[in-house]
């Protein structure tokens, strides 16, 4: 059931209410959108513009550097994940404008809304990989000197993407199109029907693997890194560390509403008032999570301006400066036992 022969009939949506104004002829359309939906549309529009342009620029800047700079590999992969998700936004935008009517067919319903979850898993797994890289640079500089290379970075990214795809499968499989009889519209959503336990399991896995576990591990990781950095009074610029911390923090901030409402809805009775209220906020929560897809380029620009004092350089060169800074260990051509202490001190800053 890939596409419906659906034509919008000569009567409308009645805004999801089980009420019908009988003074109004049945065949008239109600065009009012809810406030959360309007806010979601505004966010989607901004995210699309900033996300597509910003991430395209980041991809362009980092792609050339990815062969020789490991940081560029990390930021390139993050930008690709964000850019991919932004491509679904015009479709999601159109659907909300049409009162959540989905005229794009079953295949699009399975793929497009799943992109944000793919982005979530890909982003958090990439951020975990980046964080592990920062951690090793601080605590295992010798190991980094010997083994930290572009090849290993690309393998780590490939693993992150593979796992992200794997974790997105449940959402993908349970997405269906449902054509409601009245008010007449096709809806795209998840349907677990008989399996409430499976719905809860998917929500719990999403919360734990996509939010709580990363939050815990990354908090511990950066606590150690920052403590070591401050205790050693690092001399090098902490620009990459600051950028990564900002990216990680924004991830958790913008995914929080989606995760909270998602877990609540999986435990609530679908006909309960709380469930229905949360469902009305669903688009807004998704749009809020989508801010992740455009926030990184903003962070990079803000960071670049901060490091430059003011925006003197062109945007690409500013981004290049932020995203392609190589870590200290790679800059040292010769490495001897006598330099270990100095190395350990220098790498605190990355």
């Amino acid at each position: 059931m890939d596409s419906f022969n659906y034509t919008t009939p000569d009567y409308g949506h009645y805004d999801d209410k089980d009420t019908l104004d009988l003074n109004t002829p049945v065949d008239k359309t109600s065009n009012t959108l809810r406030v959360p939906d309007i806010l979601a549309l505004v966010i989607f529009a901004v995210v699309f513009l900033v996300g597509v342009l910003g991430n395209a620029l980041v991809v362009w800047v980092t792609a050339f550097e990815a062969k020789r700079t490991i940081n560029a590999i990390w930021f390139l992969n993050l930008a690709v994940a964000d850019f991919l998700s932004c491509l679904a936004l015009p479709i999601l935008f159109t659907s909300i404008v049409q009162h959540h009517h989905w005229p794009f067919g079953g295949a699009a319903c399975s793929i497009l809304p799943s992109l944000i979850l793919l982005n979530m898993y890909a982003s958090i797994l990439l951020l975990a990989t980046i964080s592990a890289d920062r951690f090793l640079l601080v605590f295992k500089p010798i190991w980094c000197q010997n083994f930290r290379g572009a090849g290993l970075a690309w393998i780590a990214c490939a693993v992150a993407w593979g796992l992200a795809l794997l974790l997105t499968i449940p959402s993908f499989l349970y997405r269906v199109v449902r054509e409601e009889y009245f008010p007449p519209k096709v809806l795209c959503g998840v349907d677990y029907s008989h399996d409430k336990r499976r719905e809860r399991a998917v929500a719990i896995v999403r919360l734990v693997l996509g939010f709580l576990w990363p939050l815990l591990t990354l908090t511990i990781c950066y606590t150690f890194i920052l403590l070591r950095t401050w205790s050693r009074r690092a001399t090098r610029s902490t620009k990459t560390l600051k950028v990564v911390v900002a990216v990680v923090a924004s991830f958790f901030i913008f995914w929080l509403p989606y995760q909270v409402t998602g877990i609540m809805m999986s435990f609530l009775e679908p006909s309960s008032p709380t469930f229905l209220l949360l469902k009305k906020l669903d688009s807004l929560c998704v749009s809020f999570a989508y801010i992740n897809c455009c926030i990184n380029p903003i962070i990079y620009v803000v960071a670049g301006q901060g490091f430059q004092g003011r925006l003197r350089k062109s945007l690409p060169s500013l981004l290049r400066n932020v995203l392609t800074e190589e870590s200290v260990v790679r800059e040292s051509k010769s490495f001897t036992r006598s330099t270990v202490d100095t190395m350990a001190q220098k790498t605190q800053a990355v």
Partner: antibody, heavy 125, light 112 residues
Framework: QVQLQQSGAELAKPGASVKLSCKAS????????MHWVKQRPGQGLEWIGY????????KYNQKFKDRATLTADKSSSTAYMQLSSLTYEDSAVYYC??????????????????WGQGTTLTVSS | DVVMTQTPLSLPVSLGDHASISCRSS???????????LHWYLQKPGQSPQLLIY???NRFSGVPDRFSGSGSGTDFTLKISRVEAEDLGVYFC?????????FGSGTKLELR
């Protein structure tokens, strides 16, 4: 009182067409949607589609979309269903059923409150 | 299409007995507005179907209070507290949440 009077039994050959009628009385014809339902002998009910007599808008079950045509004549308060390219599988009782747009605390055309007596269609060579 | 599965197919009862008919849908019948559009019809021998219960639990006008409906999502039940002779016939559940509208295969309530 509300009445839906359906036309008499029909006998038709395979490949032919028939037009069944359903005359409404006792209420305002254009204020209610008219649905058509099929029931094969000893079997369940199957929804064919509906017509909004006020606007002429129709919606069909995909299974019947190519062969069923629903129409309504406001002046005579009569709904019609034409079935074309008949096969033996079309032998059944066909009901017209009225759908109220509001009832009690329920608003929306969700259930059939009155049914016609049914028209028996027999397809035989 | 939403498949409506009714159990049992046949229900032999004695007059005055309690009767319970189950209806299960292949997809959730919760509409985007939160309602379940699940209805029950009775078809007496040689007659057209007649509406008993609409929207899960609301009795249609003239329907005795011995008939009651319950359920949500995918599982629904029709209960008859004290079966009377006029209750005999075939009971159909029907959903009007999704297109196409579909009916259960029917449960025949008959005397033991």
């Amino acid at each position: 009182q509300v009445q839906l009077q359906q036309s008499g039994a029909e006998l038709a050959k395979p490949g032919a067409s028939v037009k069944l009628s359903c005359k409404a009385s006792g209420y305002t014809f254009t204020s209610y949607w008219m649905h058509w339902v099929k029931q094969r002998p000893g079997q369940g009910l199957e929804w064919i589609g509906y017509i909004n007599p006020s606007s002429g808008y129709t919606k069909y079950n995909q299974k019947f979309k190519d062969r069923a045509t629903l129409t309504a004549d406001k002046s005579s308060s009569t709904a019609y269903m034409q079935l074309s390219s008949l096969t033996y599988e079309d032998s059944a009782v066909y009901y017209c059923a009225r759908v109220p747009l509001s009832y009690g605390s329920s608003y929306g055309p969700y259930f059939f409150d009155y049914w016609g007596q049914g028209t028996t269609l027999t397809v035989s060579s | 299409d939403v498949v409506m599965t009714q159990t049992p197919l046949s229900l032999p009862v004695s007059l005055g007995d309690h009767a319970s008919i189950s209806c299960r849908s292949s997809q959730s019948l919760i509409h985007s507005n939160g309602n379940n559009y699940l209805h029950w019809y009775l078809q007496k021998p040689g007659q057209s179907p007649q509406l008993l219960i609409y929207k899960v639990s609301n009795r249609f006008s003239g329907v005795p209070d011995r008939f009651s409906g319950s359920g949500s999502g995918t599982d629904f039940t029709l209960k008859i507290s004290r079966v009377e002779a006029e209750d005999l016939g075939v009971y159909f559940c029907s959903q009007s949440t999704l297109v196409p509208l579909t009916f259960g295969s029917g449960t025949k309530l008959e005397l033991r």
